[in-house]
Amino acid sequence: AVDLTLLANLRLTDPQRFFLTCVSGEAGAGRGSDAWGPPLLLEKDDRIVRTPPGPPLRLARNGSHQVTLRGFSKPSDLVGVFSCVGGAGARRTRVIYVHNSPGAHLLPDKVTHTVNKGDTAVLSARVHKEKQTDVIWKSNGSYFYTLDWHEAQDGRFLLQLPNVQPPSSGIYSATYLEASPLGSAFFRLIVRGCGAGRWGPGCTKECPGCLHGGVCHDHDGECVCPPGFTGTRCEQACREGRFGQSCQEQCPGISGCRGLTFCLPDPYGCSCGSGWRGSQCQEACAPGHFGADCRLQCQCQNGGTCDRFSGCVCPSGWHGVHCEKSDRIPQILNMASELEFNLETMPRINCAAAGNPFPVRGSIELRKPDGTVLLSTKAIVEPEKTTAEFEVPRLVLADSGFWECRVSTSGGQDSRRFKVNVKVPPVPLAAPRLLTKQSRQLVVSPLVSFSGDGPISTVRLHYRPQDSTMDWSTIVVDPSENVTLMNLRPKTGYSVRVQLSRPGEGGEGAWGPPTLMTTDCPEPLLQPWLEGWHVEGTDRLRVSWSLPLVPGPLVGDGFLLRLWDGTRGQERRENVSSPQARTALLTGLTPGTHYQLDVQLYHCTLLGPASPPAHVLLPPSGPPAPRHLHAQALSDSEIQLTWKHPEALPGPISKYVVEVQVAGGAGDPLWIDVDRPEETSTIIRGLNASTRYLFRMRASIQGLGDWSNTVEESTLGNGLQAEGPVQESRAAEEGLDQ
């Protein structure tokens, strides 16, 4: 089972001191989002027991193996279901804690009930504050049963559930009809998937016989040991104040595990720590009792004394749970409760025994789960013990399970069961992922999903050029880091594969599927320089550049021109996709802007060195258009134009430009300057009689502005043909009708 413990601190006088802590003893637990260990999650589960909304609870991570929930402001915040989720992949496990209000109308005699499939479960709700009304039982939040208040027996309402099946598991509650749901008694029913003492898919396998209140897991046959006990069969007590599968965790605070509720993976549920009992786990065990919830009785023999944390403490010369075994009887010594080997390895297993008469090599044997008996190949005899060594044939998956070391002498016999886990070396299910590439290196993420078992101890990356028969190059990397493959050939495909290993002999897995990764093409090395540029309008710029002459073909696909507008902090990039190009027209620029300009050669996705920068100032855009332009014929050759100055001028006008064009004519228009900018009228002379003309005008400051509206007017008739229009008395260079 996953080594995951949810601790609830039950000092309930002050909810603000209440906390829940989830502790994981798993390798790589809670390390966050990396592929080697999903995070520990600790949360209140409001799906069944809903409490009034309050301020959000605070979650604090203490390293990678522990997470704590605080911030409870009122007692009702505590009532309900809390869960902690830990472990990776198929081992992901949820541990559940159910909290009852100490002031509720009804209180559970026992919160967690673990029963076997087919058993009768009896939930008992004790009356704490009586109400003369119906009692409603619910299962997972839905109505289940009603009792009349007269149906209480000895101040308790009982719910009998005969022949329970796994789907009956869940949260049960008993509530007076008129009471707040927070005054309910909440229970957790865990129904094992098998009958008593059995486990496995068809419940065909026999449980190891869990001691000290341990519960046999119906899926894997392992004992889920109560807090404070360890070993394959929970046969060993931890030191006072310690818990976890290997007794590696310590209860916080000076009073040890007092006031703490421990919740473990199903099918165990929750209990007080070893040596404590009561609804708030604050009462020490009565004499003669020990263990979690003080559920165990010592019954020590031969002068043994009862310790409320560990059970019988035997005097010299005696051992056994009740001190019932003489030290003359042979005894298996220091056998590890769990061993782990990799598939297809041939490990050596040692088993040591002592006793009187002294065990010899032939008196110690090893039994596999399938019943096969192995005899030791050699024995080391020391003054206080004999250690037999067994050479195990090549391991297969079916060898996973409980092995047994047995010693037999004329003084009696002893056996010790231990769990052997045969692990499958990890094999990548996917190819590694390319993160970035350059011409001579590839950056690769080796983190991939895998079949088989973790944890991953090393990652090997094998690579060689595609279609090559040369040896593979290999690099060993840290599982959690990206890898850079160096000194590669440019523009070359490489076949890259991952190999994962787990700890222990024979932990190397098969190579994963290959993937093709191609290095980038060479970087362009030539540095262009800017030959020149000229402004073709307030928003247009023509640029030209050159490249140094070098022998051989040009390494490049095109050019990138960059214009940097420092005032606005904006960059404009223009791609010229021909490596032969040496000029470009940049349009849509911002008039009146100071630009820094450079050009660089590119090849594939790589940029070469930039040219030395040039600084370009575009002329500002011109002023707004003159307003209310009006034309009035004065004679057969003269038309007077009147207008109003533009509004919101950015500076003084230097001149106006008038455009004159014969209406419907095909010729180019004529531009006439009005050099006295203070004027608001002018006379255009030298026009043809009886001719329709179009006029528009614009102002100039540093650059030409916007055109005004176009006006139309005809000269008067019967005049002679003029030589061409003039403004005031200055002649134009050519006639309008030419």
């Epitope: 009304t133 049963y145 009603t146 008129e178």
Partner: antibody, heavy 117, light 108 residues
Framework: EVQLLESGGGLVQPGGSLRLSCAAS????????MGWVRQAPGRGLEWVSS????????HYADSVKGRFTISRDNSKNTLYLQMNSLRAEDTAVYYC??????????WGQGTLVTVSS | QSVLTQPASVSGSPGQSITISCTGT?????????VSWYQQHPGKAPKLIIS???NRPSGVSDRFSGSKSGNTASLTISGLQAEDDGDYYC???????YTSSTTWVFGG
């Protein structure tokens, strides 16, 4: 689908007896409180009696106390109402109903009991 | 047998809203949040339309709503439709806290 089907109604003389049955289906009958409600012709509804899931506790309206007995057989998913010493004022359509918490969430179609000489 | 008081009849035009009142005492309507309403069409069994004063069971139109103030509960039907025609009964749970046994009382 929850279904309640009453039977056993009919014409009976004053002072006579009648036993009504209600066959339940579509839910876990043994988990629910059940009840009888009646409706005299042209009148409103009147609660008659209720029984708890275990069958151990029963309640009656004052108007029928001592004359009517409610019972149930959880193995047959059936509710009963034994009516003795019937009076003319007991004439009504008798409905069997399921109790959820404190209200009648499903009703049968009713069976008519007529007490007349 | 105590009976809750309801108006003999309430009428309205299609699309209108109507409210039916139900008056009891502090021992029933006033004492609990356990008021329910039932709809009955002629010749049919009653059907639950409101529980717990204002809870609508699934499948019941949201045009039906309930409320309670003091000893009086109310059922409001908005956007009246022809199929709303029928008898409506209020009911209150009166538990053993107030009487010798669990009882229900109905409006008449």
């Amino acid at each position: 689908e929850v279904q309640l089907l009453e039977s056993g109604g009919g014409l009976v003389q004053p002072g006579g007896s009648l036993r009504l049955s209600c066959a339940a289906s579509g839910f876990t009958f043994s988990s629910y409180k059940m009840g009888w409600v009646r409706q005299a012709p042209g009148r409103g509804l009147e609660w008659v009696s209720s029984i708890y899931p275990s069958g151990g506790w029963t309640h009656y309206a004052d108007s029928v106390k001592g004359r009517f007995t409610i019972s149930r057989d959880n193995s047959k998913n059936t509710l009963y109402l034994q009516m003795n010493s019937l009076r003319a004022e007991d004439t009504a359509v008798y409905y069997c109903a399921r109790v959820l918490l404190h209200y009648f969430d499903y009703w049968g179609q009713g069976t008519l009991v007529t007490v007349s000489s | 047998q105590s009976v809750l008081t309801q108006p003999a009849s309430v009428s309205g035009s299609p699309g209108q809203s109507i409210t039916i009142s139900c008056t009891g005492t502090s021992s029933d309507v006033g004492g609990y949040k356990y008021v329910s309403w039932y709809q009955q069409h002629p010749g049919k069994a009653p059907k639950l339309i409101i529980s717990d004063v204002n809870n609508r069971p699934s499948g019941v139109s949201d045009r039906f709503s309930g409320s309670k103030s003091g000893n009086t509960a109310s059922l409001t039907i908005s956007g009246l439709q022809a199929e709303d025609d029928g008898d409506y009964y209020c009911s209150s749970y009166a538990s053993s806290s107030y009487t010798s046994s669990t009882t229900w009382v109905f409006g008449g």
